[in-house]
């Protein structure tokens, strides 16, 4: 039902859902710190613009006794329970920053009259695509899918002279929330990825994956999986791998590959890692000191959510427009705003655009090197290393079908 919003007369409130079930196991205190840091920046920006208003956040905590799994499996009802709590307390802000789990976001969007914007650090699944008042500040599955199709089709790079049309996808059900939805999108028979590929099989057992590595009758040389190097090592160990196998390891929210002292372990030589371009600077603010590189993006998305709200609030106030209108709720898209770590671009559907980076292991230096980057905003690939020191024959990526390797 319609809830009155604390969003007028120079006082603007942000409702932050602090859910026990979360896309990343991040202590809520860290997220609070990120939000508070964001608020400080927003207040400063509004003040500099001559807008004398108050901006605050209300943190809404759910009952941990009922929803205590900690991951996203029981999040569907938690989101709705929190909304009920807000409704009963009549404490809805101008904007809802909250659910990171795809299940809860989908359900909340479905079951509520959303006349206010919802900003999510997560909600990776395809079911959260194209939602008119939802903004997602971490790369959703659709963006990954578009990269993969673009890369599969590419055949005019010095190191990739074949189009690919086949793939195995390893998905065993123990994935993190982001990986679960990324792989789910690749698995879905109606998805863009499936539509564009001629052959795709999902490997669900460790043994299936291990067998493919040396199977002469395999239908594809390419295996997509999601997780970090350690995850791959647990699965692959030091097993021999056929020379034309290419493993694509999706590990978007992990800056560690770019650290100076990182050496790639030997088992990564047949692997291309897909990650996001690192931030312009490693955060050293109060909220980020306790964060691992993997968690950084999650907390940063909360912080950027606050900055996005501040950006929109400033625009609407400067134009003398009302904040509690459908126009405001639908405005959080097709724009670029100044994030904590540089400009942040949102596409026509409110999803964050980013630079994805494909890394390879240099056989010379045993370091991760950038092979190419992909700009999700323009769906374009940019080669960076034109003569990579690959493990693959002739320093070219093999064909995806066995027996038709580089020529």
């Amino acid at each position: 039902s319609q809830v009155s919003q604390n969003c007028h007369n120079g006082s603007y409130e942000i409702s932050v859902l602090m859910m026990g079930n979360s896309a990343f196991a991040e202590p809520l205190k860290n997220l609070e710190d990120a939000v508070n840091e964001g608020l400080e920046i927003v207040r400063g920006r509004l003040q500099n613009a001559g807008l004398n208003v108050t901006v605050n956040a209300t943190f809404m905590y759910s009952d941990g006794l009922i929803h205590n799994s900690g991951d996203c499996r029981s999040s569907t009802c938690e989101g709705l329970d929190l909304l009920r709590k807000i409704s009963n307390a009549q404490r809805m802000g101008c904007v809802l920053i909250g659910p990171s789990c795809t299940y809860s976001t989908f359900q909340m969007y479905l079951d509520t009259e959303l006349s206010y914007p919802m900003i999510s650090a997560g909600s990776f699944g395809l079911s959260c695509d194209y939602k008119e008042t939802l903004t997602r500040l971490m790369s959703p599955a659709r963006k990954l899918m578009y990269f993969l199709v673009n890369f599969w089709k590419t055949n005019d790079l010095p190191f990739k002279t074949y189009s690919w049309s086949t793939s195995y996808v390893y998905k065993n059900g123990t994935e993190t929330e982001d990986c679960f939805w990324y792989l789910n999108a690749l698995e879905a028979s109606v998805s863009y990825f499936s539509h564009e590929l001629g052959f795709k099989v999902v490997l669900r057992q460790d043994k299936e994956f291990q067998d493919i590595l040396m199977d002469h009758n395999r239908k594809s040389n390419v295996i997509i999986m999601c997780g970090g190097p350690e995850f791959l090592y647990k699965l692959k160990g030091d097993r021999a791998v056929a020379e034309d196998i290419v493993i694509i390891l999706v590990d978007l929210f992990n800056d560690q590959y770019f650290e100076d002292n990182v050496t790639a372990p030997d088992y990564m030589k047949n692997v291309l890692v897909l990650t996001l371009s690192p931030g312009n600077s490693l955060l050293n603010s109060s909220f980020s000191r306790n964060l691992s590189p993997t968690k950084r993006d999650f907390a940063l998305a909360y912080l950027n959510g606050i900055l996005l709200f501040g950006h929109m609030l400033k625009i609407f106030l400067e134009n003398g427009e009302n904040i509690t209108t459908p126009k405001f709720a639908h405005a959080f898209r097709n724009l670029t705003f100044e994030g904590y770590d540089g400009p942040v671009t949102l596409d026509d559907w409110g999803d964050v655009d980013s630079t994805m980076v494909l890394l390879y292991t240099s056989v010379d230096t045993k370091k991760y090197k950038v092979l190419l980057t992909y700009d999700t905003h323009v769906n374009k690939t940019y080669p960076v290393d034109m003569s990579p020191t690959f493990t693959w024959k002739n320093s070219k990526l093999p064909n995806d079908i066995t027996g038709r390797g580089p020529q």
Epitope: S277, K367, P383
Partner: antibody, heavy 117, light 106 residues
């Protein structure tokens, strides 16, 4: 508007090294490629190598591999090109240029390096 | 390495007339080609990238075409400030430049 300002002219002895700097101001530095291009007197342009500061590692043209080192300091938005074992043929104007990967849309003013005994 | 060959080496044209400069790649570079203008004592200036896209602030009289191995830069009506050296550059592989075409006043 992005500007690239290079260090001043250098005169060097054969066998020595030269290090040229290129400071960016007024725009994004880290996520663009910074290339180094040289031009010998009366000659054409020659790409030496490039770096994308946010990624750290540089890539070099084969001709200069082992003799050129390109680095970048994100904190000062400055890129550097060091060329060692100088010989008279290295006498040239050295340009830094910012580009979207390997085409170059913003150029420095150039640094003249003269190698003479 | 990809070798870029420009022709002619020198082109003499009268102001107000059009000029066509050619650039050939030793192997296909798709549409990953840029054109630059350089005046004496100055740094090069980007005119065209992606074979046909004008860079910011470049007048409409400059146009680029071609893909694969054959490329053309056309200047429709030459102004006095257009007389300079023009270079093509491929970036489908490690960048390489053509030898340049000197456009001079006839």
């Amino acid at each position: 508007e992005v500007q690239l300002v290079q260090s001043g002219a250098e005169v060097k002895k054969p066998g020595s090294s030269v290090k040229v700097s290129c400071k960016a101001s007024g725009g994004t530095f880290s996520s663009y490629a910074i290339s180094w291009v040289r031009q010998a007197p009366g000659q054409g342009l020659e790409w030496m190598g490039g770096i994308i500061p946010i990624f750290g590692t540089a890539n070099y043209a084969q001709k200069f591999q082992g003799r050129v080192t390109i680095t970048a300091d994100k904190s000062t938005s400055t890129a550097y090109m060091e060329l060692s074992s100088l010989r008279s043929e290295d006498t040239a104007v050295y340009y830094c240029a910012r580009g979207h990967y390997y085409y170059m849309d913003v150029w420095g003013q150039g640094t003249t390096v003269t190698v003479s005994s | 390495d990809i070798v870029m060959t420009q022709s002619p080496a020198t082109l003499s044209v009268s102001p107000g007339e059009g000029a066509t400069l050619s650039c050939r790649a030793s192997q296909s570079v798709s549409s990953n080609l840029a054109w630059y203008q350089q005046k004496p004592g100055r740094a090069p200036r980007l005119l065209i990238y992606g074979a046909s896209t004008r860079a910011t602030g470049i007048p409409a009289r400059f146009s680029g075409s071609g893909s694969g191995t054959e490329f053309t830069l056309t200047i429709s009506s030459l102004q006095s400030e257009d007389f300079a050296v023009y270079y093509c550059q491929q970036y489908n592989n490690w960048p390489s430049f053509g030898g340049g075409t000197k456009l001079e006043i006839k």
